[in-house]
């Protein structure tokens, strides 16, 4: 229970994670003017990865794509890489984690295919969750460089006679989302990799054998040792060889109207 | 058409306050910011301060802030201009305007003539 | 506060004839987001509300006739008339729409000779 539970757990909060890098992503504030040192400005610019925008007091707003590609900073470039990296593992991540769900059955699957298919989802959200936050930083690091140069050459020019401010750029609201988002995706990943351990069958030493008894299905170990019958407790929550028997997790996966897929 | 029309001429004596009107039509009222200008004896223009109609924030000249107070009303899509203590000084023809691209003020009313005179 | 400094107070002129005036602002009113200067021109006729000519220093408002014309950027502007016409006698504005509070020029009075 405890381990669909992680696993649920990881997949809700790894995709509220994803949606969150996504809209960081699109969002056009990812650097918002400085308004410290013109608190009275009437127009207020705010820039993006794909666009840069003037909000009027008046009301309108404008938009400009960055029509450019090889005109753009190498830094935009890679933020702009690292995010669609994000976006795209996690993506990948969450249809493969859809499949790995214990409470979603697809034929026959083993445990142990969900298990890998659990790890290799997590692994895919923590990556996903990395991108995002070493794009986030990036950006970030640029926005703050670029910020205290500009305060460096704050008054160009006209001899201190005309006051000619340059415009400044601040950490806008796209920054937090991605960085909460990706937090969230990398949370979610580590999860999965948590569920997966208690998902995967825990490997033996030796081969298991069935003594097959003429009056009573009872599976027999090497040594003597009785492993498992079909009424008994399967404490080690593995499968075992009756087809009938469920293991405690299965008993307590019947699909629900609280299940979100 | 767009059009801006604002009451009527007021006389009023030093110390009252009045109250001037600009009702609005042709357009959609809570989609454009309404600025107040003051045009004293046909000199320049003085910006008093605008409102935005759909949330109701208010900014102000500083020069104009404890004077005038700006409101709207959405029903009616009537915007209003409350002038307070009221002196000589005060007396100017007033406009209101509607905001526009650039911030520039693309439609105005027809004018208020305020006389303040005991 | 922004100050608009207009240039000359008054212009008399003959119909027909190119008509420059200036407008001089105490600060920057280019926005480096997009490229765009917040001076707006206006017409003014007495007894009447002023006009909207030009905003963004050079963009006409609609129904205005193209022999008006507005240039510069930064700190310096230029309003051109190119022909004079008899119904252009009015006075002109020129208005800081960067920073609040939006302040106006004193104005230039054009008249005819």
């Known amino acids: 229970m405890a381990v669909t539970a992680c696993q649920g757990l990881g997949f809700v909060v790894s995709l509220i994670g994803i949606a969150g890098i996504i809209a960081a992503t699109c969002m056009d504030q990812w650097s918002t003017q400085d308004l410290y040192n013109n608190p009275v400005t009437a127009v207020f610019n705010y820039q993006g990865l794909w666009r840069s925008c003037v909000r009027e007091s008046s009301g309108f707003t404008e938009c400009r794509g960055y029509f450019t590609l090889l005109g753009l900073p190498a830094m935009l470039q890679a933020v702009r890489a690292l995010m669609i990296v994000g976006i795209v593992l996690g993506a990948i991540g969450l249809l493969v984690s859809i499949f790995a769900l214990k409470c979603i059955r697809i034929g026959s699957m083993e445990d142990s295919a969900k298990a890998n298919m659990t790890l290799t989802s997590g692994i895919m959200f923590i990556v996903s969750g990395l991108c995002a936050i070493a794009g986030v930083s990036v950006f970030a690091n640029m926005l703050v460089t670029n910020f205290w140069m500009s305060t460096a050459n704050m008054y160009t020019g006209m001899g201190g006679m005309v006051q000619t401010v340059q415009t400044r750029y601040t950490f806008g609201a796209a920054l937090f989302v991605g960085w909460v988002a990706g937090g969230l995706t990398l949370i979610g990943g580590v999860m999965m990799c948590i569920a997966c351990r208690g998902l995967a069958p825990e490997e033996t030493n030796y081969k298991a054998v069935s003594y097959h008894a003429s009056g009573h299905s009872v599976a027999y170990k090497p040594g003597g040792f009785k492993a498992s019958t079909g009424f008994g407790s399967n404490t080690k929550n593995k499968k075992i060889y009756d087809g009938g028997a469920r293991t405690e997790d299965e008993v307590q996966s019947y699909p629900s109207k609280h299940d979100y897929v | 058409e767009f059009q801006l029309q604002q009451s009527g001429p007021e006389l009023e004596k030093p110390g009252a306050s009045v109250r001037i009107s600009c009702k609005t039509s042709g357009y959609s009222f809570t989609g454009y910011n309404m600025n107040w200008v003051k045009q004293s004896n046909g000199e320049s223009l003085e910006w008093i301060g605008n409102?935005?109609?759909?949330?109701?924030?208010?900014r102000y000249n500083q020069k104009f802030k404890g004077k005038a107070t700006l409101t709207v009303d959405k029903s009616s899509s009537t915007a209003y201009m409350q002038l307070k203590s009221l002196t000589s000084e005060d007396s100017a023809v007033y406009y209101c305007?509607?905001?526009?691209?650039?911030?520039?003020?693309?439609?105005w009313g027809q004018g208020t003539t305020l006389t303040v005179s005991s | 506060d922004i100050v608009m400094t207009q240039s000359p107070s008054s212009l008399t002129v003959t119909a027909g004839e190119k008509v420059t005036m200036s407008c001089k602002s105490s600060?920057?009113?280019?926005?480096?987001?997009?490229?765009?200067?917040?001076l707006t021109w206006y017409q003014q006729k007495p007894g009447q509300p002023p006009k909207l000519l030009i905003y963004?220093?050079?963009t006409r408002e609609s129904g205005v006739p193209d022999r008006f014309t507005g240039s510069g950027s930064g700190t310096d502007f230029i309003l051109t008339i190119s022909s004079v016409q008899a119904e252009d006698l009015a006075v002109y504005y020129c208005?800081?729409?960067?920073?609040?509070?939006?302040?106006f020029g004193a104005g230039t009075k054009l008249e005819l000779k």
């Open positions: 208005q800081n729409d960067y920073s609040f509070p939006f302040t």
């Open positions: 305007a509607r905001s526009y691209y650039g911030n520039a003020f693309d439609y």
């Open positions: 409102i935005d109609p759909y949330y109701g924030g208010t």
């Open positions: 963004w220093a050079s």
């Open positions: 600060q920057n009113l280019l926005n480096n987001g997009n490229q765009k200067n917040y």
